[in-house]
Interface confidence: low
Amino acid sequence: GSERTCCPVNWVEHERSCYWFSRSGKAWADADNYCRLEDAHLVVVTSWEEQKFVQHHIGPVNTWMGLHDQNGPWKWVDGTDYETGFKNWRPEQPDDWYGHGLGGGEDCAHFTDDGRWNDDVCQRPYRWVCETELDKASQEPPLL
């Protein structure tokens, strides 16, 4: 495939990544799938700069990100290391992260109305943000 050099229509470029901001709500799994079908992933926040950028675009609305602990430890969907990476949890959050992996837990992370993170029930229909890297090879065949 060819490398992306610019963002798709209706996506916003920031620091060599492209972002798409939903205006409807989906369960985390459905949002995750939506981004994958767009050859992207739920947003992975790696810095305070990126946090501020996303926060500016979503406003004070609960919004899914690509962080979950459904199989035990917290994991970013793109493999970014959680333990050493950027975090912006609300005080006393995450509060239900005993990592049972059995459903019914607060296993997915979202931006809250003030931008800080909370873990919540993955089935809640929140808005979401997709992200894809500009330097990533796209799935489209190269132009001949």
């Epitope: 369960a27 799994a29 979950h68 199989n71 969907v77 239900d96 019914g104 607060e106 029930v121």
Partner: antibody, heavy 116, light 113 residues
Amino acid sequence: QVQLVESGGGLVKPGGSLRLSCAASGFTFSDYYMSWIRQAPGKGLEWVLYISGSGTTTYYADSVKGRFTISRDNAKNSLYLQMNSLRAEDTAVYYCARDRGGLDVWGQGTTVTVSS
Amino acid sequence: DIVMTQSPDSLAVSLGERATINCKSSQSVFFHSNNKNYLAWYQQKPGQPPKLLIYWASTRESGVPDRFSGSGSGTDFTLTISSLQAEDVTVYYCQQYFSLPFTFGPGTKVDIT
């Protein structure tokens, strides 16, 4: 052994209120989501509400939203269901159940009858 | 809401024969991030609360006889009783716990011919 025991059911007039309790024993109560499920006479099962282990997250089915409130007291290993503005269609056996990816432990149920 | 349907409404099977109950969800309950189907099966005898038989569509609950098995993925699921026993004659429900509100199927009654 792991057990759930409901109480508080009874006969109430339309518009009235009732508070159901569910006493848990035999497991670490605060580690589990808990649900209330009801079953009208001769009918199927209807899941109505749940609450997270810490009590910070609740969810209500549309049929009870604004009328029913779920709460828990982890220190007392107890789950509660406050039912207000009761209607005839709320008549059912009410079960509390432990949510573990599938409802794996159920109480015997308590009967609520709403009738004038 | 995800709507759950079951078929047949009732079925009659000879003792020792196979009983098959189908459950269909109006949208997929499969979550690829953990490779699981968020579907459970319950048995309910008269005057008793439901009993969990199967969760994650195919995992048998502890203590459930191995004649009960679950299969399927996505939107189509099956509960199979490989050799019907007299104590299995009752009502069976499927339930999805993928999307709020969690919803049950209408139930299937199993009888002996």
